[in-house]
Amino acid sequence: FPMFKRGRCLCIGPGVKAVKVADIEKASIMYPSNNCDKIEVIITLKENKGQRCLNPKSKQARLIIKKVERKNF
């Protein structure tokens, strides 16, 4: 679950509510910063199927964020 900085929000519009766990290659979390004032959860899909932004308020996103925070703190 890597975290990285960027120059602006990457996610736009409504995020998906959930992604099948079996389809997830990795999850990246970007916390609010000067560049983007919201938390973003970006899922990279397996088999080069691209990336999706998760709705940060969704149950799945909250679980991922919790998992990362347990790991890092």
Partner: nanobody, 126 residues
């Protein structure tokens, strides 16, 4: 049943205007963004305009900036594409599509869209 129904296409002279509508049903409107795409004969489908009804953010392809305006009426679950100063090269079948989970880099990626309309023909004569 999810449905996206486009209307408003037709034949117009160069320099004229049309307003396309995309009426959505069968899903929660705020959970999706709507993109307008077009496909001219023998060409690939290309993104034209995009709107998130949840926060009102909009994007336009360079080829239509300043001429086309996208808007949404959340009460009617409908997205509109106002097309002004039309050119012959705008001739195409216009489709609306609904999707979610976009990154700034993927709004024109057709695979990101879950639902598509049947299209409406726009013909601009010179």
């Amino acid at each position: 049943e999810v449905q996206l129904v486009e209307s408003g296409g037709g034949l117009v002279q160069a320099g004229g205007s049309l307003r396309l509508s995309c009426a959505a049903s069968g899903f929660t409107f705020d959970d999706y963004a709507i993109g307008w795409f077009r496909q001219a004969p023998g060409k690939e489908r290309e993104g034209v305009s995009w709107i998130s009804s949840s926060d009102g953010s909009t994007y336009y392809a360079d080829s239509v900036k300043g001429r086309f305006t996208i808007s949404s009426d959340n009460a009617k679950n409908t997205v509109y594409l106002q097309m002004n100063s039309l050119k012959p090269e705008d001739t195409a079948v216009y489709y609306c599509a609904a999707g979610a989970g976009f990154l700034i880099t993927t709004i024109w990626t057709t695979q990101m869209y879950d639902y598509w309309g049947q299209g409406t023909q726009v013909t601009v004569s010179s």
